[in-house]
């Protein structure tokens, strides 16, 4: 049961977690314009991955897309990807999770593919919640490292075609929930990866009764070992008793056949 | 590569009004502001007034009521209309394009001098 919840709840942990990715990808508000010792406040701009936003004093709202003939920063271009790699492994995780989930029933699907398969969804959650963390992170420094260029420019730059940069910009609410929802599909991550052990085939240890034979002495001990008599061949101790594959789900402590020799 | 051209400075008797223009070429972010800027010798830069793509418009607060500001985006040209002009508004006047493409560009002109002494 622990199994079931702690897969279930990994799934769910991880749909809002990549929810969330997406829903930070598309956002516009990835950095706003610091108003903090501006000058203009007619207009204020906020930006995103993918366009640029300017609210007008008169509450019009314009927005366009990053204009590509000036060339975008390579930063930008490594945010984007990492984001769109972050939706994409998340999104693959999420359809196997839903076929490796315990509690629903694909024709006989055994349950070391059903292990197999919570493992590599949860690894691919796992490195999904990495990849959103590095691109929002990678986006913060590149704002930190423009402000403080900003502020060191902002009262530069008179005569001659100089550019400088006057506009600074401080975190947006982009970069929280992307932070947020990486984390979320890195925890439910983790969730699938402990289901994964729970749900894979372990040899399960049978306690033995003693028993007394007629000839040499010959015993069962727990854990399934053959007491060797020194004159029989498993010198070494070799497992000769392989317990049935079980599930920790389906033990049973009723007397089996193999219980007694 | 964007360039802005500044026009119309000028000696200026007290009293007197003044039109300056800007043009900016080349090819920049739809998403804009083009203002005015002043700067007086041994002062900082001074922001007089500007106007967004959008048409909004801001003004410094000493030369509300007499500056005008106006764009003509079909020629991408900014335009200041200065009235009532006082010895204190004697400057270098500078054209400033501010484009909102990621974290925003900054383009400037050479400046233009405006002289007001009777």
């Known amino acids: 049961m622990a199994v079931t919840a702690c897969q279930g709840l990994g799934f769910v942990v991880s749909l809002i977690g990549i929810a969330g990715i997406i829903a930070a990808t598309c956002m516009d508000q990835w950095s706003t314009q610091d108003l903090y010792n501006n000058p203009v406040t007619a207009v204020f701009n906020y930006q995103g991955l993918w366009r640029s936003c300017v609210r007008e004093s008169s509450g019009f709202t314009e927005c366009r897309g990053y204009f590509t003939l000036l060339g975008l920063p390579a930063m930008l271009q490594a945010v984007r990807a990492l984001m769109i790699v972050g939706i994409v492994l998340g999104a693959i995780g999420l359809l196997v999770s839903i076929f490796a989930l315990k509690c629903i029933r694909i024709g006989s699907m055994e349950d070391s593919a059903k292990a197999n398969m919570t493992l590599t969804s949860g690894i691919m959650f796992i490195v999904s919640g990495l990849c959103a963390i590095a691109g929002v992170s990678v986006f913060a420094n590149m704002l930190v490292t423009n402000f403080w260029m900003s502020t060191a420019n902002m009262y530069t730059g008179m005569g001659g075609m100089v550019q400088t940069v006057q506009t600074r910009y401080t975190f947006g609410a982009a970069l929280f929930v992307g932070w947020v929802a990486g984390g979320l599909t890195l925890i439910g991550g983790v969730m699938m990866c402990i289901a994964c052990r729970g749900l894979a085939p372990e040899e399960t240890n049978y306690k033995a009764v003693s028993y007394h034979a007629s000839g040499h002495s010959v015993a069962y001990k727990p854990g399934g070992f053959k007491a060797s008599t020194g004159f029989g061949s498993n010198t070494k101790n070799k497992k000769i008793y392989d317990g049935g594959a079980r599930t920790e789900d389906e033990v049973q402590s009723y007397p089996s056949k193999h219980d007694y020799v | 590569e964007v360039q802005l051209v500044e026009s119309g400075g000028g000696l200026v008797q007290p009293g007197g009004s003044l039109r300056l223009s800007c043009a900016a070429s080349?090819?920049?972010?739809?998403?804009?502001?083009l203002a005015w800027y002043r700067q007086a010798p041994g002062s900082q830069r001074e922001l007089i007034a500007l106007?967004?793509?959008?048409?909004?418009?801001q003004y410094g607060d000493s030369v509300k009521g007499r500056f005008t500001i106006s764009r003509d985006n079909a020629k991408n040209t900014v335009y200041l209309q200065m009235a009532s002009l006082k010895p204190e508004d004697t400057a270098v006047y500078y054209c400033n394009l501010h484009t909102y493409d990621f974290l925003g560009r900054d383009y400037w002109g050479q400046g233009t001098q405006v002289t007001i002494s009777s």
């Open positions: 080349g090819q920049f972010f739809s998403l804009n502001y």
């Open positions: 106007v967004s793509s959008g048409g909004s418009t």
